[in-house]
């Protein structure tokens, strides 16, 4: 080994070196939280970049760059260090137009803490292992969601566009002429029935067990879907999103009530099956796999 390499190895294995890097990262994180940093922080930024560069140089000199089994770039944790340094120099010396977008990569510096703290490194390692093990469960989840999304698509396509429309139109008005002239929220409220405090027109349906319109209103299929058009089963992708919402139980009762009002109470069976399978079974299966992965990592 050359004297330079010997010195680099000594520095690398020294506990003070790890301590210095850890303190640098934490101080850097504190500086990054500043809203309006003063001008002198620019020099501090250069110091941090210098320390990170020094750390990487020490590692490269001690272990080699990329040829060989235990070299710098063969360790995935060092990829992060390398990216951090590259972006630090890029944002500083190269004019790339939208620098603010590149500046967001400075946040990656905070992730360097993981590679420095051994316990954290183990946990993240376990997390990555669990993600690998999750692939099969994820495939099953996506498959189940896709199947139910297709069923939802067939059962409820267009149903959430059913609205209670005012019967007493002016003599020259028609549904089409009104829809062409509607602009504001007030215009909509003039012709469609809204429950007090509701931001969407009252949903209705054409089956006997679906929601009925109040007197003076008739059920029509027109306009957009509820929640600014985001809640629907009109395409596979929207149906998939709705099913994902059911699986994660994200305000699912609202989707359930909307659909049952538009399609009919019979369709509660669909929701019972989806909640039991998707929300109770699949979510717990995912948790079980993650727990197993952590257990294996600990052993």
């Amino acid at each position: 080994f050359s004297p330079l390499r010997r010195i680099s190895i000594k520095i690398l294995v020294h506990s003070l070196f790890s301590m210095l890097i850890m303190c640098t990262i934490l101080t850097n994180c504190i500086f990054m939280t500043m809203n309006n940093p003063p001008d002198w922080t620019k020099n501090v930024e250069y110091t941090f970049t210098g320390i990170y560069t020094f750390e990487s140089l020490v590692k490269i000199l001690a272990r080699g760059f990329c040829v060989g089994e235990f070299t710098f770039l063969r360790d995935p944790w060092n990829w992060l260090d390398f990216v951090v340094i590259v972006f630090a120099y890029l944002t500083e010396f190269v004019n790339l137009g939208n620098v603010s977008a590149l500046r967001t990569f400075r946040v990656l510096r905070a992730l360097k803490t993981i590679s420095v703290i051994p316990g954290l490194k183990t946990i993240v390692g376990a997390l990555i292992q669990s993600v690998k093990k999750l692939s099969d469960v994820m495939i099953l989840t996506v498959f189940c969601l896709s199947v139910f999304a297709l069923i939802g698509l067939q059962l409820f396509m267009g149903n959430l566009k059913h609205k209670c429309f005012r019967n007493s139109l002016e003599n020259n008005e028609t549904l089409e002429s009104i829809m062409n002239t509607l602009e504001s929220e007030e215009d909509f409220r003039k012709y469609f029935y809204y429950l007090e405090g509701s931001k969407d027109a009252l949903l209705c349906g054409f089956s006997t067990d679906s929601g009925q319109c109040p007197e003076g209103y008739t059920c029509v299929k027109i306009g957009r879907n509820p929640d600014y058009g985001y809640t629907s089963f009109d395409t596979f992708s929207w149906a998939f999103l709705a099913l994902f919402r059911l699986m994660t139980q994200d305000y699912w009762e609202n989707l359930y009530q909307q659909t049952l009002r538009a399609a009919g109470k019979t369709y509660m069976i669909f929701f019972v099956v989806v909640i039991f399978l998707g929300s109770f079974y699949l979510i717990n299966l995912i948790l079980a796999v993650v727990a197993m992965a952590y257990e294996e990592q600990n052993q």
Epitope: M157, G158, H162, F165, N167, S168, L169, T174, L175, E176, F206, E215, G216, T218, C219, V220, K221, I222
Partner: nanobody, 124 residues
Framework: EVQLVESGGGVVQPGGSLRLSCDAS????????MRWHRQAAGKQREFVAR???????DYADSVKGRFTISRDNAKNTVYLQMNSLRPEDTALYYC??????????????????WGQGTLVTVSS
């Protein structure tokens, strides 16, 4: 496809009566309001009467007390009973309805549908 067909028109003497009917056919799920309009030769089309799906009615001032609109929801039909007819009632009578129906591919569509019209002539 939804179709509206008017019938019952014809020639009648002043003071006489006629009953017009309008039949809606197709894969109809719901009919909202149904309206009768008329258009005399060289004139603008004018509203005559309306009936909603909960049977609320409304009439043009010129026919109030003489014409009666009714509907049969089971048959998807609207009727216009015209009594005490006058020469100025001579016109082509159209039926209009707000219909929600199941169209090609099983999707649902709501829209305004019109009939071809039936001619009513009041003359001595």
């Amino acid at each position: 496809e939804v179709q509206l067909v008017e019938s019952g028109g014809g020639v009648v003497q002043p003071g006489g009566s006629l009953r017009l009917s309008c039949d809606a056919s197709g894969r109809i799920l719901r009919i909202g309001y149904m309206r009768w309009h008329r258009q005399a030769a060289g004139k603008q089309r004018e509203f005559v009467a309306r009936i909603t799906d909960d049977s609320a009615t409304d009439y043009a001032d010129s026919v109030k007390g003489r014409f009666t609109i009714s509907r049969d929801n089971a048959k998807n039909t609207v009727y216009l009973q015209m009594n005490s007819l006058r020469p100025e009632d001579t016109a082509l009578y159209y039926c209009e309805a707000l219909v929600t129906a199941s169209v090609r591919g099983g999707s649902i569509h709501s829209g305004t549908y019109w009939g071809q019209g039936t001619l009513v002539t009041v003359s001595s």
